[in-house]
Structures are given as structure tokens and as C-alpha cells.
Interface confidence: low
């Protein structure tokens, strides 16, 4: 028989106490300690160096304590794919930069997603046709601009349609073709800052007789030999919080799977051997699961619906956990600063 | 009514098919694609640059394919705490290096665990007492050795008990005391290589009048001002596989929660837009859960036993998942190399 007023409160209180006990045993187990080091508050005072490195650790590192987390904090997107390399093929340029239909090559398109990444490396790759004998080749990259009225015949160069952005002297020895890479990071930064300035580029690679060895024609017959841009990027994987789990408080009447607040207070345990944090927010999961409610893996419900022999249904469990930083005395009276994984419940779900 | 022969086989086959479908939808969703890019095998051949960076990606990165994983591979220890900083307090030296009971300071003890870490930084911190007026202080660190019979009075120095390993000239201005740090990485390396050579050190810091300003007495009255060693370490978190989950094969009669093999073949889907891998091992979870069997969080069973309103019991679900690397065409005919999280089931458990 459940007490009046709050039928789920007794259960929740029980969960809370069990979670606290479990946290104590987990900390000892994760720190590889058989029992709590026997270090009193007085001994801590004697042993704790009044020295810069300790202060630095305490200042620099977030020991979570009672710091409030803003509700709309950015969190790691652990669901979507992260992009590491983008290879963008050369496309035809805009007619505005073409004279008599040339140059058709090369424009490179970048999505807004790529433009908001940190570019670690950007290289333009150009295929140079084979030369019959060793030769010095001068490769140049010209940045295209639409032709403006002024400066066409004479003038101060304000209307220049081509601006050289890279030049390279290459010694070719091979009778087979050669892929040449050109660092393009600076140019890319300027394009990403001002996407409207990206009208494309022209690529030439002249040998001493003036023959252009660069494969830039985008027509058939040169499959796989067209210029392309290789980007190594670092994504900002912080995304605004995707509310994938319910958050409740102690007064909630929610019966579904939910995350509840729980503060662990080490001083209340009498654990003086933990220097920092003195307390932290651990949280816990509690509540019922329906088949289709908030599953960790989107496909789980399908499997479960068809499951004649598995468990009766999904369970309310942490689907995302995070570590805490801890500064503590070990059983040899050494001070250790480290990270204990899986000590904070960030999200609850049915899985 | 279950078919004869293998009562769980039909369920498993169902799980398998659902997991495959789920993987397809997850890949598209995680790559932020509304549908599979419409790129045929012929178009792939045309667009794919025959160029070094593509080859490099294919050579350098593990696309998992059909590569067999050795059963006893090392995996990340995601359970135990990782140590980042160790602060080791000065202790009394061994009597073998003391003459007339001195020097008592300083010996530093390091556990085998710390000795097997990579030491990024090692600093000895020494507190220097305040000086009444600005002064030049000569700080020296002597490495102690046990006194051997030969060469005690004079001689060739073979029996020398002190070897200077650090000397430092410090300009002191402050009327308050001063913490001085001394780089100790090289000494530490030699101690870690030959622990038997660590007999401790003696520290002096003499002002022009010959007063030793270094606080080295380990008795009371100088709490928090004793010398200590600060180490920044990088642990090898790879541990031999802890078998926290059962592995089964299709012919197994295991009814408990278990991990089953499942190979995803993109060519069989007709997904030519995925350049690599062409296939990968995804695995899936299936089976029954008892209260106390293989729970993800050691304390879960306590909460569940007392749960009058939660799910009927824990469920068989992935407790560790890992990403796959993928090289693919997106919907803009760009080639992307990236990582898709949570695509391989590494471990199943009841949680």
C-alpha cells in the first residue's frame, strides 16, 4: 500500500539513498582503493602544501561544486557524424568571370556547415600532364573576379579580373603525370570570411615552351584527373542542447523515465580525504518506460516490439554520463588530481 | 507457438533484420542526409580523383572492413579514474644515507602505477624562508647515495655520498617566503628507469651569510611548507580486455543477454555512394536479463530491486558502442571523410 499524497515519493527517496551508496562504492572502486583512506581533517591541514601548483589546480579546474549549469548550455553532439576531410571537386565558374567562354574551370563550392569549421589544412590538387623530358614548370593560381567597367584598357588595375595568389616552380622529371598540391589555407580563410569573393580560380602550369600542362578541362576524357580541393577540418561539435531526456525535480508528479537532481556531499560522508570538490551534482534516473518513449537507440523499439523472449520492456537508465575532476589523497598520502568517469548522469532514457 | 529446433532463432533473425534497417536509417540521419545520394557506381568512377590524398585516407584509416579483431585486444579502460597530477610529499630518507641522523629530508616515493605513466612535467617545489632584505640565494639539490666503505675520507670520490644534480642562483626580494620550483624531469626519468638509484635528495638554499633558507625539516611547525614533487602524467588507459559482456554466435543456445555478430554490406544495399568501407561488423544485442546479471552500472540492481513502479527489469542493450570511419559522397557530390559515432556494438549488458 502506497502512502497518500505522493505515491512515487517513497520509491524516489529509496532510489536516492541507493544511488548515494552506489556512488560511494563506485568512487572507491574507480580510484582502485580498497577502503576510504584514513586521513582526518587535521592530517589534511598538515599535509596540504600551501603552494602554487595546488592553488592552480583548484583555480583552473572545474570541480563542479555548486556551480549552476545554465539551462540552455551547449553540449557535445554525440549523435551526428563528425567530418574530418572534405574533398570538393572543381565545378564550372560563373559566366560573369568568363571571357569568350573561358575559363570554365575552376569554382569550388563549400556548404555553410564546412565554412563554420576550423580548417586545419587546405590543399588544392592539380594534375599535370606528363612531359617528354625533364622540365621546369611554372604553376600559377589566379583568383577570378567579375570584369568591372573601369580599368580594361589601361587604368590603374582596379578592374583586374585575375589576381595571382600562388606561384610555384616545379621540376618535372616523370614521364607519367604528376599530382601537385598547393597550400590553399589562407585563400580559403578569406573565402570563408567573405564567401561573395569566391568567384573561382584559374590554374596554369606552363613548361618552357609555353604549353599548359594543368588538366583543367571539366569535360569527359579526364575522369579522376580534375582539380579538387582537400580540406582537413575540425568541427565544432558543441550544439545547442537537444532535449533528448526529461528533467524533473523532487516535487514532480511525472511517472515517466526522468532525471532527478541529487547532490553528493563528501563532507557529510566524513570523507575529508577528498580535497575537491567538497560536493557535486550526481543526479539519478527514475520512472517508467513505455515502448516508444525516449529510447537511446532510435531502432530499439522495433526490436523490443518483436521480442518474445527479451525483457518486458525498456528500462529507465542513464543514456549519457560524464566524469568529474577530483583532487584527493590516496592511501599513500600522495595528492592525486584526476578524472573519474561516469559519475554524473547527464541524461536518462529508455533503452 | 515457437518453431521446433531453435526457439530463439526466429526472434534473433527478426532482431538482425530490424538492426540492419535501423543502421541504414541511422547512417542517413547521422550524416544529415534526407535520403541516400543518387550516385551510381559509374558516377563514382568518374568523380573519384585518382589522387594521393584519397589513397592516403584509404591506406591510413581503418575502415574496419573484414579485418579480424584479435580476441584479446587492448581496449580503453573507461571505468577507472585517470590520473593527471600526482603530488608526492617529502618523506624521511633511509638511514643508510644519513650521517648522525641527517639529512632526514628528502625521499619521494612513487608507486609502480606512476612509474609506468608518461611524465609530461616534473617539478620539485621548495619553500624558501623570507629574507629581511634583497639577497642572492644559491639553491642546490644533491642526490644522496648510501655511504660505501672505500673513499670515505678523501679518495677518488668513488664513495661520495652527495652528487650535485641541480644548482640555481635566485634573486630574493620578498619579505614573505617564496615557493621555488625546479625542473626535475630528467632526474625522475633516471629514478623511474632505475628505482634502486632513488635514495633521495638533500636541498640547501644559502644566502650570502651562509643561512640555509630552504624549509626541509619534516617536523611540526612548518605544516604545508615541506618540499614536494609535482608530476603531470599521461596514463596508458589501454587495459587488457575486461570481459564485461557475453559474446555469442548464431548457433549459440544462450538465452541470456549476449552480443551477436552482424555484418552490414553496403554493396548489398546498393549504396555505391559509400566509398569505404564496403562492409563493416556492426553486431547486435539479444537475450534475457536477470536482476543481477551484467549490469552497466554496478549499483543498478539495488535500485531496480526496490522499484515498485519502474520497468519490470533491466533490458539487454548496448553498453559500449564505437564509431566507424567512413569515406562517402554527400548530396553535393563532395567526398567526405569522417567518423560516425555509435555504429558498432562493442558490448551488451543489462541496464
Amino acid at each position: 500500500p502506497e502512502p497518500d499524497g505522493c505515491p512515487v515519493c517513497v520509491w524516489r527517496q529509496h532510489s536516492r539513498e541507493l544511488r548515494l551508496e552506489s556512488i560511494k562504492s563506485q568512487i572507491l572502486s574507480k580510484l582502485r582503493l580498497k577502503e576510504a583512506p584514513n586521513i582526518s581533517r587535521e592530517v589534511v591541514k598538515q599535509l596540504l602544501p600551501k603552494a602554487p601548483p595546488l592553488q592552480q589546480i583548484l583555480d583552473l579546474h572545474d570541480f563542479q561544486g555548486d556551480a549552476l549549469q545554465p539551462e540552455d548550455f551547449l553540449e557535445e553532439d554525440e549523435y551526428h557524424a563528425t567530418t574530418e576531410t572534405v574533398i570538393s571537386m572543381a565545378q564550372e565558374t560563373d559566366p560573369a568571370v568568363q571571357t569568350d567562354g573561358s575559363p570554365l574551370c575552376c569554382h569550388f563550392h563549400f556548404s555553410p556547415k564546412v565554412m563554420f569549421t576550423k580548417v586545419l589544412k587546405a590543399q588544392l590538387w592539380v594534375y599535370l600532364r606528363p612531359v617528354p623530358r625533364p622540365a621546369t614548370v611554372y604553376l600559377q593560381i589566379l583568383r577570378l573576379k567579375p570584369l568591372t567597367g573601369e580599368g580594361t584598357a589601361g587604368g590603374g588595375g582596379g578592374g583586374r579580373r585575375h589576381i595571382r595568389i600562388r606561384s610555384l616552380k616545379i621540376e618535372l622529371h616523370s614521364r607519367s603525370g604528376h599530382w601537385q598540391s598547393i597550400d590553399f589555407k589562407q585563400v580559403l580563410h578569406s573565402w570563408f570570411r567573405q564567401p561573395q569573393s569566391n568567384w573561382g580560380i584559374e590554374i596554369n602550369a606552363f613548361d618552357p615552351s609555353g604549353t599548359d600542362l594543368a588538366v583543367t578541362s571539366l569535360g569527359p576524357g579526364a575522369e579522376g584527373l580534375h582539380p579538387f580541393m582537400e580540406l582537413r577540418v575540425l568541427e565544432n561539435t558543441k550544439r545547442s542542447r537537444r532535449n533528448l531526456g526529461l528533467d524533473c525535480d523532487e516535487h514532480s508528479s511525472e511517472s515517466r523515465c526522468c532525471r532527478y537532481p541529487l547532490t553528493v556531499d563528501f563532507e557529510a560522508f566524513g570523507w575529508d580525504w577528498i580535497i575537491a570538490p567538497k560536493r557535486y551534482k550526481a543526479n539519478y534516473c527514475s520512472g517508467q518506460c513505455e515502448y516508444m518513449f525516449m529510447q537511446k537507440y532510435p531502432h530499439t523499439h522495433l526490436v523490443q516490439q518483436a521480442n518474445p523472449r527479451g525483457s518486458a520492456g525498456p528500462c529507465c537508465t542513464p543514456t549519457k554520463m560524464s566524469p568529474i575532476n577530483m583532487l584527493y589523497f590516496n592511501d599513500k598520502q600522495q595528492i592525486i588530481y584526476g578524472k573519474i568517469p561516469g559519475m554524473v548522469v547527464d541524461r536518462c532514457g529508455c533503452s | 507457438p515457437e518453431p521446433d529446433g531453435c526457439p530463439v532463432c526466429v526472434w534473433r533473425q527478426h532482431s538482425r533484420e530490424l538492426r540492419l534497417e535501423s543502421i541504414k536509417s541511422q547512417i542517413l540521419s547521422k550524416l544529415r542526409l534526407k535520403e541516400a545520394p543518387n550516385i551510381s557506381r559509374e558516377v563514382v568512377k568518374q568523380l573519384l580523383p585518382k589522387a594521393p590524398p584519397l589513397q592516403q585516407i584509404l591506406d591510413l584509416h581503418d575502415f574496419q572492413g573484414d579485418a579480424l579483431q584479435p580476441e584479446d585486444f587492448l581496449e580503453e579502460d573507461e571505468y577507472h579514474a585517470t590520473t593527471e597530477t600526482v603530488i608526492s610529499m617529502a618523506q624521511e630518507t633511509d638511514p643508510a644515507v644519513q650521517t648522525d641522523g641527517s639529512p632526514l629530508c628528502c625521499h619521494f616515493h612513487f608507486s609502480p602505477k606512476v612509474m609506468f605513466t608518461k611524465v609530461l612535467k616534473a617539478q620539485l617545489w621548495v619553500y624558501l624562508r623570507p629574507v629581511p632584505r634583497p639577497a642572492t640565494v644559491y639553491l642546490q639539490i644533491l642526490r644522496l647515495k648510501p655511504l660505501t666503505g672505500e673513499g670515505t675520507a678523501g679518495g677518488g670520490g668513488g664513495g661520495r655520498r652527495h652528487i650535485r644534480i641541480r644548482s640555481l642562483k635566485i634573486e630574493l626580494h620578498s619579505r614573505s617566503g617564496h615557493w621555488q620550483s625546479i625542473d626535475f624531469k630528467q632526474v625522475l626519468h633516471s629514478w623511474f628507469r632505475q628505482p634502486q638509484s632513488n635514495w633521495g635528495i638533500e636541498i640547501n638554499a644559502f644566502d650570502p651569510s651562509g643561512t640555509d633558507l630552504a624549509v626541509t625539516s619534516l617536523g611540526p611547525g612548518a605544516e604545508g611548507l615541506h618540499p614536494f614533487m609535482e608530476l603531470r602524467v599521461l596514463e596508458n588507459t589501454k587495459r587488457s580486455r575486461r570481459n564485461l559482456g557475453l559474446d555469442c554466435d548464431e548457433h549459440s543456445s544462450e538465452s541470456r543477454c549476449c552480443r551477436y555478430p552482424l555484418t552490414v554490406d553496403f554493396e548489398a544495399f546498393g549504396w555505391d555512394w559509400i566509398i569505404a568501407p564496403k562492409r563493416y561488423k556492426a553486431n547486435y544485442c539479444s537475450g534475457q536479463c536477470e536482476y543481477m546479471f551484467m549490469q552497466k552500472y554496478p549499483h543498478t540492481h539495488l535500485v531496480q530491486q526496490a522499484n515498485p513502479r519502474g520497468s519490470a527489469g533491466p533490458c539487454c542493450t548496448p553498453t559500449k558502442m564505437s564509431p566507424i570511419n567512413m569515406l562517402y559522397f554527400n548530396d553535393k557530390q563532395q567526398i567526405i571523410y569522417g567518423k560516425i559515432p555509435g555504429m558498432v556494438v562493442d558490448r551488451c549488458g543489462c541496464s
Epitope: L142, R161, H162, S167, E202, N204, F206, S209, G210, D212 | -
Partner: antibody, heavy 123, light 107 residues
Amino acid sequence: QVQLVQSGGGVVQPGRSLRLSCAASGFTFSSYAMHWVRQAPGKGLEWVAVISYDGSNEYYADSVKGRFTISRDNSKNTLYLQMNSLRAEDTAVYYCAKDFWSGYPQYNWFDPWGQGTLVTVSS
Amino acid sequence: EIVMTQSPATLSLSAGERATLSCRASQSVSNYLAWYQQKPGQAPRLLIYDASNRATGIPARFSGSGSGTDFTLTISSLEPEDFAVYYCQQYGSAPLTFGGGTNVEIK
């Protein structure tokens, strides 16, 4: 072997005109921008004008703008400098020079140079 | 326009000595700088381009360095044929401009 051979220099009175020529060989003339550079007696070098590989673009130093015209005939592999309204300060050795790069007029360095031709403007 | 200033105007050295020629731009030209050698009665000859790249056929004793506004041409050990006038030239922006030259003469 890349070569530039100049002709057309001489003595001319102020206000008169003169045309310089520069015959190119040993490279694809029609692929390269070309320049004129001059050097007054005992003085340094001064860039005069540039023309694009196809003759569609040309640029001039302020000191000659409106008086000099650079042109080319790709069928004859020849570069020209038409100098009108000549002044005493135009007295110099005039060099034609191949732009190091091909294509549109870039502001570049020169390799090789012609042997030079002396223009003396004097009454 | 960008003004190029070379120093010293004259450098008197003996064969085998090291020559260091300086060129300063009135504003940054990145690495868009060339060096030329000119002997009496001859056309200039390209030595260095892009501040530090030796042109084809130029001996290794010639080297260029610098970027932005300050550049140096170094001849590690003077040969008799190296005594000449040296010019720097910027091609960072229009119009192209040359320095006044440094005359390297035999001491």
C-alpha cells in the same frame, strides 16, 4: 632558347613619335604577358607598361599614360611600344621583357629581358 | 606607389668576401620581391624571385631572404664576375617599382 631581339631606337625630337619592336622566339609568345622597362642614362630601372597574352588588357606607368601605347601581334611573335609626344625625360634604354607568368597581366618579375635599345629625345 | 630603398648605394669588397645587400619597401609587399644583376652595357638578369627562390641557372652563393618590408640579398663568397649593380623590384601591387640599386665594386 628563349630570346628577345629589340629594334627601333634612335634619336628623336621632343614632341615627335617613335615605335619600338621586340621579336620573340623560343617560347609560346601568345601565352605570356609582356612588359616594357626603361633605364635613363646612369639611373635605375623604371617599369613602363604591360600587355596581356591576348592583347585584351594593358596597363601603364603614370609617367607615360596617354602618350605611350603597348601592343602585340601574336601571329608575328612581336611586341611593340608606340611612343608619342616624346619628352627629354623619356630618354632612356628601353628593354622589352617577358613576364615570368603567362596569362593576364600580372604584376610580376621579368625573365628574360631583351638586349635594350637606346631612345634619345633631344632637340 | 610603393617606394623601394636600397642600401648601401655602393659596397666595396674583395673577391671571396661576403656581400649583404638590403632592400626596404615603404609598405608590405609580402614575399613579392625579385633581385636582378646588371653589368655595364647589358640587360638585367633575374637572380631571385618571391624573395628567396633562386632563378634557373643562378649559383647557390646567391640567396635571398625577408618578407613584408625588409629584404636581403646575400652573396656568400664574391666571385670576380659578381661585381655589378644589383636591383630589387616589388610586384606586390601596381605599379611595379625598382630600388635605386647597389653597386658592388672591387675594393
